[in-house]
């Protein structure tokens, strides 16, 4: 009785269970009653990352420098190349097929998390007591100046975009 299902790492062909090719290898010929499955390792810049019956290996991803990409990890016969972005850029998707410049946090917002090759800048609004007066991809919200520690008084209140303005204490007051 010919099999209708095969074990793990096997496939059914011509009423027969044949061994799949291991990762990094492609199928050259199916097994027969007398011979085993024939496989061949993937060639240069090719890979297969699963047990398979593919007759062609996949091409390694190309990290196109024109799109701001560079190689983070070179591919092997069993793994694809991993791309990342050049300095100052980050991937537009998880598969990292192109790059865009990191966003800057506008005045009133500070950097919560600096961008990486795969993630954009994360900004946060400056809370009360903090400010940012620049557009930056690196600067966090800074605390308002403490006039008291300088024996000064607040002449102008700070905002999320401006620091407080300190001035001398009024000597008239007792």
């Amino acid at each position: 009785e010919p099999p209708t299902a095969c074990r793990e790492k096997q496939y059914l062909i011509n009423s027969q269970c044949c061994s799949l090719c291991q990762p990094g290898q492609k199928l050259v010929s199916d097994c027969t009653e007398f011979t085993e499955t024939e496989c061949l390792p993937c060639g240069e810049s090719e890979f297969l990352d699963t047990w398979n019956r593919e007759t062609r290996c996949h091409q390694h991803k190309y990290c196109d420098p024109n799109l701001g990409l560079r190689v983070q990890q070179k591919g092997t016969s069993e793994t694809d190349t991993i791309c990342t972005c050049e300095e100052g850029l980050h991937c537009t998707s998880e598969s990292c097929e192109s790059c865009v410049p990191h966003r800057s946090c506008l005045p009133g917002f500070g950097v919560k998390q600096i961008a990486t090759g795969v993630s954009d800048t994360i900004c946060e609004p400056c809370p009360v007591g903090f400010f940012s007066n620049v557009s930056s991809a690196f600067e966090k919200c800074r605390p308002w100046t403490s006039c008291e520690t300088k024996d000064l008084v607040v002449q102008q209140a700070g905002t999320n975009k401006t620091d407080v303005v300190c001035g001398p204490q009024d000597r008239q007051r007792a």
């Epitope: 011979t35 496989c39 016969s77």
Partner: antibody
Framework: EVQLLESGGGLVQPGGSLRLSCAAS????????MSWVRQAPGKGLEWVSA????????YYADSVKGRFTISRDNSKNTLYLQMNSLRAEDTAVYYC?????????????WGQGTLVTVSS | QSALTQPASVSGSPGQSITISCTGT?????????VSWYQQHPGKAPKLMIF???QRPSGVSNRFSGSKSGTTASLTISGLQAADEADYFC???????????FGGGTKLTVLG
């Protein structure tokens, strides 16, 4: 017990031909890939050629491509290497080696080798 | 395609451990987990000791182990014995049209 027995070596002049044979026993011959590997006197190992279990797929080192032909007769449990246009640098002990299962790039059993000398 | 690079010789005393390195390129050892190691005693046929970087065929002592890092494979023999004295060859599949390349071989001497 797996056994591989090479024959057909000898002295041959440059430009001449030889046919090596390897008689296999102790395993189901058609289920294993087979290779020829050579070793020049006092030197290291050099892979020469391989064939899949069916004999349809064949592979050659650059150094012998176009001059050597590997074949097998599964009904006779025998592997062959036809060597033409022989050169002095082909002088070596030629080993017949069994591929580990269907992987002809690993050699789990070897014959004792047959010496091929190319000299005028 | 030039051969994989192995030290010409290594030595060790009985009971010690030794490691033989095998340096290739990103086209062979670095690209494939298809590295094997062979032991050859003088006048004898080679014997498969390790395949697929670190797998031992049945019947090979667990004193023999293989590993790989980047483009360098290594064979480690622990608890050296006099019978381990032999030549050792590494081997790798390669992306070049030569398909399979060997190292130049390493002569292991067991001292004493």
């Amino acid at each position: 017990e797996v056994q591989l027995l090479e024959s057909g070596g000898g002295l041959v002049q440059p430009g001449g031909s030889l046919r090596l044979s390897c008689a296999a026993s102790g395993f189901t011959f058609s289920r294993n890939a087979m290779s020829w590997v050579r070793q020049a006197p006092g030197k290291g190992l050099e892979w020469v050629s391989a064939t899949g279990g069916s004999g349809i797929s064949t592979y050659y080192a650059d150094s012998v491509k176009g001059r050597f032909t590997i074949s097998r007769d599964n009904s006779k449990n025998t592997l062959y290497l036809q060597m033409n246009s022989l050169r002095a640098e082909d002088t070596a002990v030629y080993y017949c080696a069994r591929g580990y299962s269907n992987s002809w790039w690993y050699f789990d059993y070897w014959g004792q080798g047959t010496l091929v000398t190319v000299s005028s | 395609q030039s051969a994989l690079t192995q030290p010409a010789s290594v030595s060790g005393s009985p009971g010690q451990s030794i490691t033989i390195s095998c340096t290739g390129t990103s086209s062979d050892v670095g690209n494939y987990n298809l590295v094997s190691w062979y032991q050859q005693h003088p006048g004898k046929a080679p014997k498969l000791m390790i395949f697929e970087v670190n797998q031992r065929p049945s019947g090979v002592s667990n004193r023999f182990s293989g590993s790989k890092s980047g483009t360098t494979a290594s064979l480690t023999i622990s608890g050296l014995q006099a019978a381990d004295e032999a030549d050792y060859f590494c081997c790798s599949y390669t992306t070049s049209s030569t398909y399979v390349i060997f190292g130049g071989g390493t002569k292991l001497t067991v001292l004493g």
